[in-house]
Structure formats: C-alpha cells, structure tokens
Interface confidence: medium
Amino acid sequence: MAVTACQGLGFVVSLIGIAGIIAATCMDQWSTQDLYNNPVTAVFNYQGLWRSCVRESSGFTECRGYFTLLGLPAMLQAVRALMIVGIVLGAIGLLVSIFALKCIRIGSMEDSAKANMTLTSGIMFIVSGLCAIAGVSVFANMLVTNFWMSTANMYTGMGGMVQTVQTRYTFGAALFVGWVAGGLTLIGGVMMCIACRGLAPEETNYKAVSYHASGHSVAYKPGGFKASTGFGSNTKNKKIYDGGARTEDEVQSYPSKHDYV
C-alpha cells in the first residue's frame, strides 16, 4: 500500500513538475526590466526564451518573436535546449510511468516489468528536473552577470564622459516557476525510484514461493533471510522471471520488504 501511494504521489508530483517546466519554457517573463526608480510613465520590458515584450504605461502589450536562430546568444540556445530536453524526457517519463502504476492493470504485465518501468520513469524525471533546474540556473547566472555589468556601466558611463542609462533586467516569474517545477520533477523522480525499490522485493518473494512449489530445491546459504528474498544465491534464478531487464547490481541495491515495516 505504501509503495502504491509513493508511486502514485511520485507520478502526481512529477506531472505537476513537468507541467510547470512546460509553462516556464513558454512564459515570456524570464527576464523582466528592473523597475528601480523607474518613472510611472515608463514602459515595462520583459523577455522570454522565444520572444520579447513591451508593455506600455497604458497597459498595451506588444510581443515580438526572435525570428533568427543564428543571431541569438549561445547561452540562450543552450537554455532552450536544456528546457526542451527536460520536457521531452519528462513527457516520456510520464508515458512510461502511467503503464508502471501499480493501480493500473494492463494485460498480464509482470510486477517486475512495472518495477523496471517505475525505475526508468523515475530516472527520466530526475534527469528532466535537473535539465530544467540547470536551464533556469544558466539563464539566472546570465542575468546576474549582465545586471552587474550594466550597473557598472550606468555609474561609470563611457570614461565618465557620457551618461548612459541602460535597461537592467532582473529575474522574471518564469525562473521561479522553472526552479520549483524542476524541483518537483526531481522529487517525483526520487519518489518513483523509491517506489521501485519497494516493488522489487514484493514480486521477488512471490516468485520465490511459486518457484518452490514447482518442486525445485532451494539452496539456503548463510546470511539470514537473504536467500528467501532474492538477495543471496537466488538472484541468478530470479533473472529467469526478470526478463534480464536489470543487472545483478541493480537487484542487489533494492532493500527487502522488511525495510518498509
């Protein structure tokens, strides 16, 4: 029950996270004009990954897309790539995790396959979340660097001769959405991985019982309950039912069901 809840919650959290990553990627407010000491009559500039916008003091807003690909800064391209990779991985992860959900029965899918899919989706969510966090952080770093550069220029001018007022940009709402969404996707992924660790021993115990019933002898080795949970000499036998989807190292990394009691 705890495993199902963990898996379900992991799925929901990841779903919210990926929706947030998509929203952040599409949002226009990645960088917003620093309004420090700005006049009431000023226009408000803000920029996204795909277009930049100007909101007049009247409230009228006009946005223009970046209709060039080669002319854009490499960092912006990198952020776009990271966010898209995050979305794609997250979407695939969601698709995989739907089939992996314990509460959903699809034909005669083995629990071992579900555990496998849960782990796969969990890893995808983790990578997706990391991509989003990385993308947002790269953009934020770019903003911080430019902010202080323009602040320096603002006070020094060109050799103190010309007074220039540059538009400074600060963190937009999309950055916070991206950070939170990336974090949620990451958490969801971790939860899926934890759920997977819970799925594996349960199905192993079940397989061990049916295996014994078929008349084969069980080789007990020293080491307490390990032999009966697939952590000892049974791991080789277990591979027959596993479809070879996991390495022995992966199997051995799972705790027994007793760890959840």
Partner: antibody, heavy 117, light 107 residues
C-alpha cells in the same frame, strides 16, 4: 508619421463649457496614453491630465479635478477634453500630447480657447 | 508634487555663444527629465530626453546632463534659430510638472 490634429479655436462665454478634440493618426491609438497640457498666453506649460484609451482610465491633476473631463472615441482614434464653468482663467491654448515613456515626443498644434462675455 | 525650478527666467546671448540653462527638481527624479524648445505661436518641440539623450533630428549643439535633482541644458555655438523659450519637464511621477521656462534672446 504620427500626427495629432486638434479642433479649431473656440470663443465661449463665461460659465459655459467647451469640448475640444484631438484626432490621432500614424500609430495604434489605444497603445499610448493621451495627455493634455494648458498654456496661458505668455506663460508656461501646465499638465492637466491624461486619458488612457486602452482601458478608459483617466487621471487629472488636483487643480483640474471637476474642471476638465477627458474621454476618447476608439473607433475614430480621437481624444476629447471638456472644460466646464469657464472663466477668464481658462483662456489658454490647450495641447493634446502623446507621451513616449517620460517624454512628450508628439504634440497637437493646440486649440485656443478664449473666454469672453 | 515635484516642483521644477528653472533658471534663469530670461537670458541674453550673442550668436556663437555657449549658453547653459539649469533645472532643479524638488526631489530625486533620477534621469527622467526632458527639455523642450518653444517658439512663439508654436507647440513645444522635444530636444532632450532622459536628461542627456538627443531626440531625433535635434542638432548636436544641444546637450543635456545631470541626474537626481540637478540638470543642465547646454547650447554651444548659438544660432539664430535657437531663439525661443526652453522648458524642462519631469516624467518621474504624476502630476507631470514643467519648469517656468527660460526665454532666450539675442543681445
């Protein structure tokens, strides 16, 4: 090219009211706030207020509250200012002006209002 | 309201002179100050915005400087067509306020 075409001069009696117009062309009318400025003969410039055609919001300076009413007609891209209870103090040239950020880059040619019995 | 104190109120100069008009704001307006030129019977024309930026089509002999509360308009090498009244205007907050004006005359 941005143009602000104001209505012609007005000769009005004290106590009456006057409504002047300012037709905008060469830009999206609802995009920018329209301001109104008063200039008495031989004197300086005085900000009356603004009308925002985008959301029909208006703001007038304390001095002109209850005196000036600002409106607009989006369909004809025209801004209006009505001044009521006219006195000799209201005899002036009234300009409509288009603000770009903090600066008035475009002005109407002005409407001369003369209050005389 | 932000008061704009402009000085001098009138100024006599000869052609080719460099003249300076000052404008003082009653509170900090950063760089949100514009300068206008008005000739008799005409509407004001924008010369300088954001304290030091020259508006399109304005001759380079006009220049502006200052920030915070003190601002100056400088006309180098005065020309006959520069004879007019000059106004400063703050755009930091409503109500927008203008200086009383500086009437420039030829000596």
């Amino acid at each position: 090219e941005v143009q602000l075409q104001q209505s012609g001069p007005e000769l009005v009696k004290p106590g009456a009211s006057v409504k002047m117009s300012c037709k905008a062309s060469g830009y999206t009318f609802t995009r920018y706030i329209m301001h109104w400025v008063k200039q008495k003969p031989g004197q300086g410039l005085e900000w009356i207020g603004y009308f925002n055609p985008y959301n029909d919001d208006s703001k007038t300076s304390e001095k002109f509250k209850g005196k000036a009413t600002l409106t607009s007609d989006k369909s004809s891209s025209t801004a209006y200012m009505e001044i009521n209870s006219l006195t000799s103090e209201d005899s002036a040239v009234y300009y409509c002006a288009k603000l770009r950020q903090e600066r008035i880059a475009y002005w109407g040619q002005g409407t001369l209002v003369t209050v005389s019995a | 309201d932000i008061q704009m104190n402009q000085s001098p109120s009138s100024l006599s100069a000869s052609l080719g002179d460099t003249i300076t008009i000052t404008c003082h704001a009653s509170q900090n307006i950063d760089v949100w100050l514009s300068w206008y030129q008005q000739k008799p019977g005409n509407f004001p024309k924008l010369l300088i915005y954001k304290a030091s930026n020259l508006h399109t089509g304005v001759p380079s002999r006009f220049s502006g400087s200052g920030s915070g509360t003190g601002f100056t308009l400088t006309i180098s090498s005065l020309q006959p067509e520069d004879i007019a009244t000059y106004y400063c205007q703050q755009g930091q907050s409503y109500p927008l306020t203008f200086g009383a004006g500086t009437k420039l005359e030829l000596k």
